[in-house]
Amino acid sequence: ARNGDHCPLGPGRCCRLHTVRASLEDLGWADWVLSPREVQVTMCIGACPSQFRAANMHAQIKTSLHRLKPDTVPAPCCVPASYNPMVLIQKTDTGVSLQTYDDLLAKDCHCI
Amino acid sequence: ARNGDHCPLGPGRCCRLHTVRASLEDLGWADWVLSPREVQVTMCIGACPSQFRAANMHAQIKTSLHRLKPDTVPAPCCVPASYNPMVLIQKTDTGVSLQTYDDLLAKDCHCI
């Protein structure tokens, strides 16, 4: 159940896809990845106010309990709902390999 | 890739399954759920320090970028990796129904 996409905190403040450019050095991959040398990492960042992009029933419960017990129960969290694949050309013991990662770049976000 | 389960912050401080007792009133369900009157909600709570229970490559990247840019990139977040089903007996227009919810109770946690 994909709940309200209206952000009550103001435009761009709630859970959404952001792009962060990162070098292989930033990621700690410089020694074993050949290409690309930099990645446009898409990730899910932002607040999850009441029922905003609630992923499922669990997220709805979490919102209710966070309201009641904010010190015990955290608010839902902005995480990937799906991913885009990415190919890395990487060094191996025997040479090089092409590895497709299906869980590297966020495609869509929700709150859970 | 389920990374290290050792919590560097001390026992019980990192991402793990917690149980929170909640009444139908707490959950806002009193008007439409007949049974149970109380739910033992299992949810994922706790910190996600470097590589602790990293769900996938995305979580590993997030950790690296959070270290570099803590104001821009949040740390990974503790969320359900899987769920346990739960049956609710609920009121309907015509009487009652048994509804199984597959996404209500967290079964296992990871960081993403």
């Epitope: 292989l24 020694d31 290409s35 446009q40 694949p85 060094k91 497709t100 | -």
Partner: antibody, heavy 119, light 107 residues
Framework: EVQLQQSGPELVKPGASMKISCKAS????????MNWVKQSQGKNLEWIGL????????IYNQKFKGKATLTVDKSSTTAYMELLSLTSEDSAVYYC????????????WGQGTSVTVSS | DIQMTQSPASLSVSVGETVTITCRAS??????LAWYQQKQGKSPQLLVS???NLADGVPSRFSGSGSGTQYSLKIISLQSVDFGSYYC?????????FGGGTKLEIK
């Protein structure tokens, strides 16, 4: 200003080997991969392979494995491609080309080196 | 290997016209595609990366679009400097193959 300056045209005999150089300037040499591309008479372009000057890793188009060897000299910021056991099929213009850091294009190209294999 | 099928192979058009060149990949390449222009006797020049991103200094009359297996390069209001050959190239798994090229000639 980014520049890739390739060595001059070559006329070589069948069976011989030769090395083309590509001198890079105007950017951090180890920060970008260097690719090599073959353009045969007419128009078709073929990707030969790439070298990562930072970690020395190479990847080749299977078609050119054993035909081309890619190396770099970091101190002189120069990339090299050695072509082995040349035949008339290897007559072409060869380009070095810098790969963008995101790995989805080649943004600067050398002027090309014409290789003619003939007895 | 992924095959890149480019069409048309050649095109004869007048200055001021609009043209669209297409490239079809034999499998999904997730927008990992570049377009190049090459003039006779010169090196290729980058026009577009990542299917839609115009390279620095490329005039806005050029635009790239597409996703999945289908991509296109559009040139509106053709100018005389735009004549030459155009190539697409994918960057999804190696080898990074090129399309067969499209030769754009003045009518």
């Amino acid at each position: 200003e980014v520049q890739l300056q390739q060595s001059g045209p070559e006329l070589v005999k069948p069976g011989a080997s030769m090395k083309i150089s590509c001198k890079a300037s105007g950017y951090s040499f180890t920060g970008y991969n260097m690719n090599w591309v073959k353009q045969s008479q007419g128009k078709n372009l073929e990707w030969i392979g790439l070298i990562n000057p930072y970690n020395g890793g190479t990847i080749y188009n299977q078609k050119f494995k054993g035909k081309a060897t890619l190396t770099v000299d970091k101190s002189s910021t120069t990339a090299y491609m050695e072509l082995l056991s040349l035949t008339s099929e290897d007559s072409a213009v060869y380009y070095c080309a810098r790969e963008v850091r995101l790995g989805n294009a080649m943004d600067y190209w050398g002027q090309g080196t014409s290789v003619t294999v003939s007895s | 290997d992924i095959q890149m099928t480019q069409s048309p192979a050649s095109l004869s058009v007048s200055v001021g016209e609009t043209v669209t060149i297409t490239c079809r990949a034999s499998e999904n390449i997730y927008s990992n595609l570049a377009w190049y222009q090459q003039k006779q006797g010169k090196s290729p020049q980058l026009l577009v990366s990542a299917a839609t991103n115009l390279a620095d200094g490329v005039p806005s009359r050029f635009s790239g679009s597409g996703s999945g297996t289908q991509y296109s390069l559009k040139i509106i209001s053709l100018q005389s400097v735009d004549f030459g050959s155009y190539y697409c190239q994918h960057f999804w798994g190696t080898p990074w193959t090129f399309g067969g090229g499209t030769k754009l000639e003045i009518k």
